[in-house]
């Protein structure tokens, strides 16, 4: 089982849409696949896929989940809020027939506020 996640870095404006993709590949067929998205280590959702369908379509606040055969799991955040900023990780495990798990690399999501004055904490600082 292998999981490839993208993009590595995603910068979007508040109120727009963000799409995170997780490619889950397994050399042999599987009956049930457990998938999980986390943000900053906290679980957003943990549905499973069987018979080509997701057991859950919602994933965290304003998050929609979709599965496109043969291997694409997509998390769509719409509309994006400042709270969506963080580090997202996709994890997958074949539960049937044999337990095997893998996780992707981090996708870092940065959300730019509509109001630039809210962005003070993002001002670059340089060493003296």
């Amino acid at each position: 089982l292998s999981v490839q996640q993208g993009p590595n870095l995603l910068q979007v404006r508040q109120g727009s849409q963000a799409t995170l993709v997780c490619q889950v590949d397994q050399a042999t067929a599987w009956e049930r696949l457990r998938v999980k998205w986390t943000k900053d280590g906290a679980i957003l959702c943990q549905p499973y896929i069987t018979n080509g369908s997701l057991s859950l379509g919602v994933c965290g606040p304003q998050g929609r989940l979709s599965w496109q055969a043969p291997s694409h799991l997509t998390l769509q955040l719409d509309p994006v809020s400042l709270n969506h900023s963080g580090a997202y990780v996709c994890w997958a495990a074949v539960e049937i027939p044999e337990l095997e798990e893998a996780e992707g690399n981090i996708t870092r999501l940065f959300v730019d506020p509509d109001d630039p004055t809210q962005n003070r904490n993002r001002i670059a600082s340089f060493p003296g």
Epitope: D25, T28, A29, W30
Partner: antibody, heavy 120, light 113 residues
């Protein structure tokens, strides 16, 4: 371009352990998402999957051989190996190493094969 | 274990004529989760290692001549050669990749009449 090359003794005595090595060139054996396999072909017969090992070290063996088979990887040498214990004349075959990727469920690169005869 | 049954075992063909090989599996090789059939076709030319021709039942590997085609779904699969050439001689094997253990058909020997 990935290339595989089998090596090992061409003659093994009954009850001993058959040991073969597959050297991988043009590709890192520790790359995520890849499996490294052994397949054999008895003289004039069809193909038999022995087993494979994945990039994480997980092994999958043919149940008909499982009690006698060990597949392992040496990442420092970019090699993987096959050990088959307690061999008999029925283990006489051409042994192939092959590779496949998680995202493509097929063996896309094969070694040229090495003939192993079990005889006293 | 999934049993793969190939027919015919021997196939004499005149160059330029079509050829067809059947492969039946003892259980379905289709997955609704991935929308794929886990069935591959290989050609082993005399004295060589097998080479992949077709994967996922119908996808031709890059570089394989378009006279080779694969079809079928579930348990019933076919490899067709539209016009056989002398270089097509060898043993053809179907193989499932649905689950472990992976198994191959017994092979079909294609020979030129």
């Amino acid at each position: 371009q990935v290339q595989l090359q089998e090596s090992g003794p061409g003659l093994v005595k009954p009850s001993q352990t058959l040991s073969l090595t597959c050297t991988v060139s043009g590709f890192s054996i520790s790359t995520s998402g890849y499996y490294w396999s052994w397949i054999r072909q008895h003289p004039g017969k069809g193909l038999e999957w022995i087993g494979y090992i994945n990039y994480g070290g997980g092994t999958y063996y043919n149940p008909s051989l499982k009690s006698r088979v060990t597949i392992s990887v040496d990442t420092s040498k970019n090699q993987f190996s096959l050990k088959l214990s307690s061999v008999t004349a029925a283990d006489t075959a051409v042994y192939y190493c092959a590779t496949m990727a998680d995202r493509f469920a097929f063996f896309d690169v094969w070694g040229q094969g090495t003939m192993v005869t079990v005889s006293s | 274990d999934i049993v793969m049954t190939q027919s015919p075992l021997s196939l004499p063909v005149t160059p330029g004529e079509p050829a067809s090989i059947s492969c039946l599996s003892s259980q379905s090789l289709f997955s609704s989760n991935t929308n794929r059939n886990y069935l591959n076709w290989y050609l082993q030319k005399p004295g060589q290692s097998p080479k992949l021709l077709i994967y996922h039942a119908s996808t031709r590997l890059s570089g394989v001549p378009d006279r080779f085609s694969g079809s079928g779904s579930g348990t019933d699969f076919t490899l067709k050669i539209s016009r056989v050439e002398a270089e097509d001689v060898g043993d053809y094997y179907c193989q499932h990749h649905y689950e472990t253990p992976l198994t191959f058909g017994d092979g079909t020997k294609l020979e030129i009449k």
